[in-house]
C-alpha cells in the first residue's frame, strides 16, 4: 500500500507481486519524487483501493496504456 509519511509526498516501498485485472482499475498516478526510494505507479481500483506497482513490469505498462485509451475515448 502507498504510504504518505510527510504529506503531500506519497511513496511506495513494496510492489504488488500479482497482476491485477485491468478491468478492475479505475485510474493511476506515477510516483517520481526524488524523496521516494523508487519510482512507482499507484493504481486506484473501481472500489477505491490503492495499489503500488512496478512501472518496469509489462502488465503495469499495459494497464496504464489501457487506462490512457479509456480516458481518451469519449463515452457514448
Amino acid at each position: 500500500q502507498p504510504d504518505a509519511i510527510n504529506a503531500p509526498v506519497t511513496c511506495c516501498y513494496n510492489f504488488t507481486n500479482r497482476k491485477i485485472s485491468v478491468q478492475r482499475l479505475a485510474s493511476y498516478r506515477r510516483i517520481t519524487s526524488s524523496k521516494c526510494p523508487k519510482e512507482a505507479v499507484i493504481f486506484k481500483t473501481i472500489v477505491a483501493k490503492e495499489i503500488c506497482a512496478d512501472p518496469k513490469q509489462k502488465w503495469v505498462q499495459d494497464s496504464m496504456d489501457h487506462l490512457d485509451k479509456q480516458t481518451q475515448t469519449p463515452k457514448t
Epitope: 500479482r18 497482476k19 485485472s21 485491468v22 478491468q23 479505475a26 481500483t45 473501481i46 472500489v47 502488465w59
Partner: antibody, heavy 119, light 113 residues
Framework: QVQLVQSGAEVKKPGASVKVSCKVS????????MHWVRQAPGKGLEWMGG????????IYAQKFQGRVTMTEDTSTDTAYMELSSLRSEDTAVYYC????????????WGQGTLVTVSS | DIVMTQSPDSLAVSLGERATINCKSS????????????LVWYLQKPGQPPKLLIY???TRESGVPDRFSGSGSGTDFTLTISSLQAEDVAVYYC?????????FGQGTKVEIK
C-alpha cells in the same frame, strides 16, 4: 489455453479435513487469481474464497472463515483448498476457478471434485 | 455483501419460444466512469462446471450463439434466450464481480414445456 485439473473424489468422516488440489497449465499461478466455489447436490453456486490481488491476500467468505485454508505452490502451479471440521452439509462438488488479466470474471473452471462427508 | 436474486426459480418454455430470466442486485454493479456493469451470466449442465455465457451484462462470450442476449444496468438485469433449443436446458446463474465477496444468484432452471 488455460486448463485447470482437480484432484479426484474424496469420502471423509464428519470432523475430518479434506484437501483438494487444482493444477494450472497454460499460465503460471502468479499471473492469475485463483478462487474456489462449491455446489451442494441440487443447490446453487457458493463462492468460498480466493486470492484478491487488490488486498494482496487470500480472502474468505464469512461462512467459511476459520475452517478453510487456501494455499498455493507456485513451483508446481498448484492451488489447494483445505476444509476442516467437516460435516454432512459440506458434501458438495468443489470447483477451482480463475480469472485472467483482461477480465475480472471467472473465465476458466476446473472439472470439479466431489467431496462426500458420511459416517 | 451484494445479494443477487434471480427470478423465476424455474421456467418451462416450449421449443422455439423465448425464455427470460431476471437478476436483481442489492447494490449497483455499474461503475459509472467506464459505464460497465460488472455482471456475468453462466449456464451449467448436470455434471459439468459452469460455462461463461455473457460478461459486462451484455457482451456474449465468443462461441456463444446469438440467441443468447443480456441486458440491463445498475441493479436490474435480464438474460434472454430468443428461441429455446433442446441443448439450452440447464441452470442459469448471474454473478457480480464488482466487489468482493463475489456473489451468485440462486440459479434459474430452464426446462422444455
Amino acid at each position: 489455453q488455460v486448463q485447470l485439473v482437480q484432484s479426484g473424489a474424496e469420502v471423509k468422516k464428519p470432523g475430518a479435513s479434506v484437501k483438494v488440489s487444482c493444477k494450472v497449465s497454460g499460465y503460471t499461478l502468479t499471473e492469475l487469481s485463483m478462487h474456489w466455489v462449491r455446489q451442494a447436490p441440487g443447490k446453487g453456486l457458493e463462492w468460498m474464497g480466493g486470492f484478491d490481488p487488490e488486498d494482496g491476500e487470500t480472502i474468505y467468505a464469512q461462512k467459511f472463515q476459520g475452517r478453510v485454508t487456501m494455499t498455493e505452490d507456485t513451483s508446481t502451479d498448484t492451488a489447494y483448498m483445505e476444509l476442516s471440521s467437516l460435516r454432512s452439509e459440506d458434501t458438495a462438488v468443489y470447483y477451482c476457478a480463475i480469472h485472467e488479466f483482461w477480465s475480472g470474471y471467472f473465465d476458466y473452471w476446473g472439472q470439479g471434485t466431489l467431496v462426500t462427508v458420511s459416517s | 455483501d451484494i445479494v443477487m436474486t434471480q427470478s423465476p426459480d424455474s421456467l418451462a418454455v416450449s421449443l422455439g419460444e423465448r425464455a427470460t430470466i431476471n437478476c436483481k442486485s442489492s447494490l449497483s454493479v455499474l461503475y459509472s466512469s467506464n459505464n460497465k456493469n460488472y455482471l456475468v451470466w453462466y449456464l451449467q449442465k448436470p455434471g459439468q462446471p459452469p460455462k461463461l455465457l455473457i460478461y459486462w451484462a451484455s457482451t456474449r462470450e465468443s462461441g456463444v450463439p446469438d440467441r443468447f442476449s443480456g441486458s440491463g444496468s445498475g441493479t436490474d438485469f435480464t438474460l434472454t434466450i430468443s428461441s429455446l433449443q433442446a441443448e439450452d436446458v440447464a441452470v442459469y446463474y448471474c454473478q457480480q464481480y464488482y466487489s468482493s465477496p463475489w456473489t451468485f444468484g440462486q440459479g434459474t432452471k430452464v426446462e422444455i414445456k
